[in-house]
């Protein structure tokens, strides 16, 4: 069964500067990666980046940076300043479409107990939907 | 099949403002970006800048900043495009576009002339 | 910005001939997590919007003719017809897919010799 996973972490340089790193751990052909906060993409999350292997990379504010770290997994630096800055408590979200087996999502948030610049290893968030 | 059909071609003066549509059918409306593209008579492609629909985030080539205001309406499945303080430069058909340039409006033409 | 310079500006070639068009952009479109070359080529006919063609430096669009083809990486890019018909008479764009603002080449213009 394939599975998402999420990792948040706050850098200790910048305390309102998040990065979010997703993968998909999974034989399929990743076509589609949408990364969004404050919910599941769809289900009042707002989407920060989508991300196509091929056709390119879309991000809006606050996202800084979004790439490919690898054929299966993402990440995304957002910036924090102003209104729409992340704090410490919002959850990110990573969806994954692929072929053949469908899309799937998963969140994560800061590691209630992290300090600045460390995080939880990146295990597998748990998986909230499955669109086959 | 993604669909982008535009609104037909103004004349307007310089000073104006002028607002052209992009509807949209046959796709997910608000999960990808539509893009606006510029290109002035016998001239290349020029990028003006995105909004993503569902959350109204945008994006802007610099140099279009204070000339391009992105809005998006999900009821109707319709992007709009504000230009102000139109200049006989900003002639020019405009174009919609969507899924990374995979879709295309048929374009606007725009013309600026006292 | 990323600039794209095509050569030839304008090109000729008899039907049923190989048509190749050049790109080059001043940073690299690769993305070095995934290997892929974000760049992408246009087809432009009178009167008509572009037409996507080949994104990932190589991938034909669906529904493209496969006489279309694209290579190259970093930042050497060309588009290839490999035998040139009637219809394909137009010009070409290529565009930076890679990072904002997305940028196009200043275009080439393909005749029938």
């Known amino acids: 069964t394939p599975e998402v996973w999420v990792q948040v972490r706050m850098e200790a340089t910048e305390l309102s500067s998040f990065t979010i790193r997703c993968g998909f751990l999974g034989s399929g052909s990743i076509s589609l990666v949408t990364v969004s906060w404050g919910g599941p993409n769809g289900a009042g999350g707002t989407t920060l980046a989508v991300l196509h292997p091929e056709r390119g990379i879309r991000q809006w504010a606050p996202a800084r940076q979004a790439r490919w770290e690898t054929q299966s997994s993402i990440s995304l630096i957002l910036e924090g300043s102003g209104a729409s800055s992340p704090c410490a408590n919002t959850t990110f979200c990573c969806k994954f479409a692929s072929f053949p087996e469908g899309s799937w999502e998963a969140c994560g948030s800061l590691p209630p107990s992290s300090d600045p610049g460390l995080s939880a290893p990146p295990t597998p968030a748990p998986i909230l939907r499955a669109d086959l | 099949e993604v669909q982008l059909v535009q609104s037909g071609a103004e004349v307007k003066k310089p000073g104006s403002s002028v607002k052209v549509s992009c509807k949209a059918s046959?796709?997910?409306?608000?999960?990808?970006?539509i893009e606006w593209v510029r290109q002035a008579p016998g001239q290349g492609l020029e990028w003006i800048g995105e909004?993503?629909?569902?959350?109204?985030?945008?994006n802007y080539n610099e140099k279009f900043k204070g000339k391009a205001t992105f809005t998006a309406d999900t009821s109707t499945n319709t992007a709009y495009m504000e230009l102000s303080s139109l200049r006989s430069e900003d002639t020019a058909v405009y174009y919609c576009?969507?899924?990374?340039?995979?879709?295309w409006g048929q374009g606007t033409l725009v013309t600026v002339s006292s | 910005d990323i600039v794209m310079t095509q050569s030839p500006d304008s090109l000729a070639v008899s039907l049923g001939e190989r048509a190749t068009i050049n790109c080059k952009s001043s940073?690299?479109?690769?993305?070095?997590?995934?290997?892929?070359?974000?760049l992408a080529w246009y087809q432009q006919k009178p009167g008509q919007p572009p037409k996507l063609l080949i994104y990932?430096?190589?991938t034909r669009e669906s529904g493209v003719p496969d006489r279309f083809s694209g290579s190259g990486s970093g930042t050497d890019f060309t588009l290839t017809i490999s035998s040139l018909q009637a219809e394909d008479v137009a010009v070409y764009y290529c565009?930076?897919?890679?990072?904002?603002?997305?940028?196009f080449g200043q275009g080439t213009k393909l005749e029938i010799k």
């Open positions: 576009s969507s899924y990374w340039f995979a879709y």
């Open positions: 046959g796709g997910t409306f608000s999960s990808f970006s």
């Open positions: 909004i993503l629909p569902g959350s109204n985030s945008t």
């Open positions: 940073q690299s479109l690769l993305n070095s997590g995934n290997q892929k070359n974000y």
């Open positions: 990932g430096a190589s």
């Open positions: 565009q930076n897919a890679h990072s904002y603002p997305p940028t």
